[in-house]
């Protein structure tokens, strides 16, 4: 069954800055993400941001920046202006909607150990990066290997017969044994979130700049698409009309202009799956 995870972090450099990370684990495509605080969406929670995979983002104070991190995860940066830091005890909730299949919501708050009131400085969540783990593991193994070889050489010097030398086969076996723990540690310490490719993130469209539309890729959970899958059709300015052939919304009682470019209200953002599935564009 689909799941939603929520992680709240305090920035180590600025005690007044918080970041909420949310992700969707499951099949299906995400049609909308809402982030709220103080409770779940529709149950006393206050909206902070709404993110649409094709049309951009909308956010409200104290939200500073909402953005897509991957095709199925988002982050929201918050600026805490108050001196008492109300975020420290606040619950943040993320709701992932997949219309019309269903919606899934989960909540989380800042871990108590990250409270700025404590003497210990706030630390980020201890995620050991896979590449770092690999380097540390490899250097440890090499260090051990060198020590072991030195030990063997010293033992050889003290032996009376010079004929006993480590064969080529033995050294190969030694090398193989030295590498195996490194590979195992890399596999064991590999964190799936540490190596997420963030090249799928769309440009965010804040409502403060309604005319700053850009072309955006279609996002579908668990359907990774490279930059080549990005849409080429631009999303056009607000207040525009939809062409008749696309069969989309037009202002009540008005006709789409017959001259000039055919401006669309439902952008034809074609990505991994045709937008027909999302907007009904023909």
């Amino acid at each position: 069954t689909p799941e939603v995870w929520v992680q709240v972090q305090m920035e180590a450099t600025e005690l007044s800055s918080f970041t909420v990370h949310c992700g969707f684990l499951g099949p299906g495509s995400i049609s909308l993400v809402t982030v709220s605080w103080g409770g779940p969406d529709g149950a006393g929670g206050t909206k902070l941001a709404v993110l649409h995979p094709e049309l951009g983002t909308r956010q409200w104070a104290p939200a500073r920046q909402a953005r897509w991190e991957t095709q199925s995860s988002i982050s929201l940066a918050l600026e805490d202006s108050g001196a008492s830091s109300p975020f420290a005890n606040t619950t943040f909730c993320c709701k992932f909607a997949s219309f019309p299949e269903g919606s899934w919501e989960s909540c989380g708050s800042l871990p108590p150990s990250s409270d700025p009131g404590l003497s210990a400085p706030p630390t980020p969540v201890p995620i050991l990066r896979a590449d770092l783990a690999g380097i540390l593991g490899l250097s440890g193994v090499l260090l051990f290997g060198c020590g072991y070889l030195l030990h063997l050489l010293r033992r050889q010097k003290h032996r009376p017969t010079p004929r006993l030398q480590p064969s080529h086969t033995n050294s190969q076996a030694l090398t193989a044994q030295a590498w195996a723990p490194s590979q195992a540690s890399q596999a064991a310490l590999h964190d799936p979130y540490a190596t997420i490719n963030t090249s799928f993130c769309p440009a965010t469209l804040d409502t403060a700049h309604p005319n700053g539309w850009a072309s955006l890729p279609t996002h579908a959970a668990h359907q990774p698409q490279g930059p080549a899958a990005s849409a080429s059709t631009p999303i056009l300015a607000r207040g525009s009309f939809v062409s008749v052939e696309n069969g989309l919304y037009t202002q009540a009682g008005e006709r789409p202009p017959h001259t000039g470019p055919g401006l669309t209200l439902f952008p034809d953002c074609r990505g991994p799956r045709a937008v027909e599935g999302r907007f009904g564009v023909r």
Epitope: H52, G56, R58, S240, Y249, L265
Partner: nanobody, 120 residues
Framework: EVQLVESGGGLVQPGGSLRLSCAAS????????MGWFRQAPGKGLEGVAH???????RYVESVKGRFTISRDNAKNSLYLQMNSLRAEDTAVYYC??????????????WGQGTMVTVSS
């Protein structure tokens, strides 16, 4: 929790009329549009009509002049009056509340849907 319950669907002959209703509860102040989407059998989702928080209705081109969307704030209800129905209007109709992105109402919550069948 936001709850939307549609009613009024059914079987109707071409040229006939139907009135869909949607009873809403648990609204949040920042939801800024309410409307109807539909999904025809084997087809994609299509926005039919929506009303902004300012009360301005918007329609998909194929239903203009035939469908009328209205809202009763006192009853927390949304309606869709469908006249001159055609076979191509056959679909499951969903009542939605959502957020505006330009002139598009992105669904945040929706009902279970009501089936409208236009057939002779």
């Amino acid at each position: 929790e936001v709850q939307l319950v549609e009613s009024g669907g059914g079987l109707v002959q071409p040229g006939g009329s139907l009135r869909l209703s949607c009873a809403a509860s648990g609204f949040t102040s920042r939801t800024d549009c309410m409307g109807w989407f539909r999904q025809a059998p084997g087809k994609g989702l299509e926005g039919v009509a929506h009303i902004d928080s300012d009360g301005i209705p918007r329609y998909v081109e194929s239903v203009k002049g035939r469908f009328t969307i209205s809202r009763d704030n006192a009853k927390n209800s949304l309606y869709l009056q469908m006249n001159s129905l055609r076979a191509e209007d056959t679909a499951v109709y969903y009542c939605v509340v959502g957020f505006k992105f330009g002139d598009y109402c992105a669904p945040n919550d929706w009902g279970q849907g009501t089936m409208v069948t236009v057939s002779s």
